[in-house]
Interface confidence: low
């Protein structure tokens, strides 16, 4: 807490400018009007205040807005955002995607902090669902964002938003998350032709049921082994040797290298040895 002291004569700030850099902490507290600061927040970022000085500026905003900052101030916080706690951010009502982008830009290139996670949570809850523009923005800054959501949270993602998802955005998703996302992707891409559809749906197949894998095996898709290894074991087990051979196409030879790993190991154990022998890979059931 900064002590309340009178502003020295002639030091009252008329505007937020670089002269304030020379003010001591108590002078900033005494001589900078909080309302002036709020209206000229966009200038703060261009002035190289020390972090100690930024603490004072934050304190002034906190006093002016005890119930939480208005969006007009939030949008221009810039590096002052790094000073905010999750508790501060929970008081905000952020509705503009531009505000979200401005604050994510401050943290760009770095791990998602608790502050950013809280900000995103507030923003998405305020919107009611994870729309395409928001998802586009979040995955651009944090490719792993989608996989950080719970299955319950993912259920609010509309199928139209799935078009914004890139393969790398799903790298860290677990089967429960893909179970939620796959039906949405199937719906989103349903009007595409065979080969284009497979390219788009491929990243989501970890959530695909057996009947969809059987259907894909009839379409000459040539699934690679990396994708096959991410399929749900319970979805792979009912597939016949012929169906797996069609599904993988020229990649079927890769089964030998993966014979000790799930789901290949469990699938092999379910097959008749005679059928496995038709692959000519020396797989032993």
């Amino acid at each position: 807490e900064v002590e309340k002291t009178a502003c020295p004569s002639g030091k009252k700030a008329r505007e937020i400018d670089e002269s304030l850099i020379f003010y001591k902490k108590w002078e900033l507290e005494a001589c900078v009007d909080a309302a002036l600061l709020a209206t000229q927040m966009d200038r703060v970022n261009a002035i190289p205040f020390t972090y100690e000085q930024l603490d004072v500026l934050k304190h002034k905003l906190d006093e002016l807005y005890p119930q939480g900052y208005p969006e007009s101030v939030i949008q221009h916080l810039g590096y002052l955002f790094l000073k905010m706690s999750p508790e501060d951010i929970r008081k905000w009502n952020v509705t503009s995607l531009e505000t979200l982008k401005a604050l994510l830009e401050v943290n760009k290139g770095h791990e998602m902090s608790p502050q950013v996670a809280t900000l995103i949570d507030r923003f998405v809850k305020g919107r009611g669902q994870l729309d395409k523009d928001t998802l586009d923005t979040l995955t651009a800054f944090y490719p792993g964002y989608l996989c950080s959501l719970s299955p319950e949270e993912l259920s609010s993602v509309p199928p139209s938003s799935i078009w914004a998802v890139r393969p790398q955005d799903l790298d860290t998703c677990d089967p429960r998350q893909l179970d939620v996302l796959y039906p949405k992707a199937r719906l989103a891409f349903q009007n595409m032709n065979g080969s284009e559809y497979f390219v788009k749906i491929q990243s989501f197949l970890g959530g695909a049921p057996t009947e969809d894998l059987k259907a894909l095996s009839q379409q000459n898709v040539s699934m690679d082994l990396a994708t096959f290894m991410k399929l749900r074991t319970d979805a792979v087990l009912p597939l016949t040797v012929a169906e797996v051979q069609k599904l993988l196409g020229p990649h079927v030879e890769g089964l030998k290298a993966e014979e000790r790993h799930r789901p290949v190991r469990d699938w092999i154990l379910r097959q008749r040895q005679d059928d496995l022998d038709t692959l000519g890979l020396g797989l032993q059931g």
Partner: antibody, heavy 119, light 107 residues
Framework: EVQLLESGGGLVQPGGSLRLSCAAS????????MTWVRQAPGKGLEWVSG????????YYAESVKGRFTISRDNSKNTLYLQMNSLRAEDTAVYYC????????????WGQGTLVTVSS | DIQMTQSPSSLSASVGDRVTITCRSS??????LAWYQQKPEKAPQSLIY???SLQSGVPSRFSGSGSGTDFTLTISNLQPEDFATYYC?????????FGGGTKVEIK
């Protein structure tokens, strides 16, 4: 890709002057505060001077105050260090660096230019 | 001025080792500390900012911790390219100050 390229170093006699330049590319130069850091031969890093985004605020280490002047030309994406009354102890490689968040750490550095002060 | 004291000033280690370098400030600086790596005849490179945040593009074997006055840089699985000199720097207040450096050499 951010690039910072220093120039202007060389051999100068004690009491002489030099002007170092740092040409920046691959970044919005006018949006970042900049700094000069030096390193005497076989020694550690020493912060020399810093300048705000617009150039309106400057900072100096006590050891160079009154002798060195930092400036910038945002239209030319260039940072400068005017060094007067040079002393032997100013001999060093001079690096320009871009400052990160607020008064933050230096996220990009130039390759350095050697200044030798000797008679 | 805030003094930054690094220890050790040098150390010998082997590839695969876990290396720890400490940095102490003469007064509290919150988390406003950076770590840099410098190889001979090269410019320093930023590794860590805000005490523990990894600079973009830096391998995850580097990590930073600490706040207040005591800070640590850890290299968890020393690689041949990690033999270099490491510096800490405070940016809590002016003048900005660096530690004296820690040279990591091959054993």
């Amino acid at each position: 890709e951010v690039q910072l390229l220093e120039s202007g170093g060389g051999l100068v006699q004690p009491g002489g002057s030099l002007r170092l330049s740092c040409a920046a590319s691959g970044l919005t130069f006018r949006s970042y505060a900049m700094t000069w850091v030096r390193q005497a031969p076989g020694k550690g890093l020493e912060w020399v001077s810093g300048i705000s985004v617009s150039g309106g605020i400057t900072y100096y280490a006590e050891s160079v105050k009154g002798r060195f002047t930092i400036s910038r030309d945002n239209s030319k994406n260039t940072l400068y260090l005017q060094m007067n009354s040079l002393r032997a102890e100013d001999t060093a490689v001079y690096y320009c660096a871009k400052r990160g968040a607020a008064v933050g750490s230096f996220d990009y550095w130039g390759q350095g230019t050697l200044v030798t002060v000797s008679s | 001025d805030i003094q930054m004291t690094q220890s050790p000033s040098s150390l010998s280690a082997s590839v695969g080792d876990r290396v720890t370098i400490t940095c102490r400030s003469s007064q509290g600086i919150g988390s406003w500390l950076a770590w840099y790596q410098q190889k001979p005849e090269k410019a320093p490179q930023s590794l860590i900012y805000a005490a523990s945040s990894l600079q973009s593009g830096v391998p995850s074997r580097f990590s930073g911790s600490g706040s207040g006055t005591d800070f640590t840089l850890t290299i968890s699985n020393l690689q041949p390219e990690d033999f270099a000199t490491y510096y800490c720097q405070q940016y809590n207040s002016y003048p900005l100050t660096f530690g004296g450096g820690t040279k990591v050499e091959i054993k």
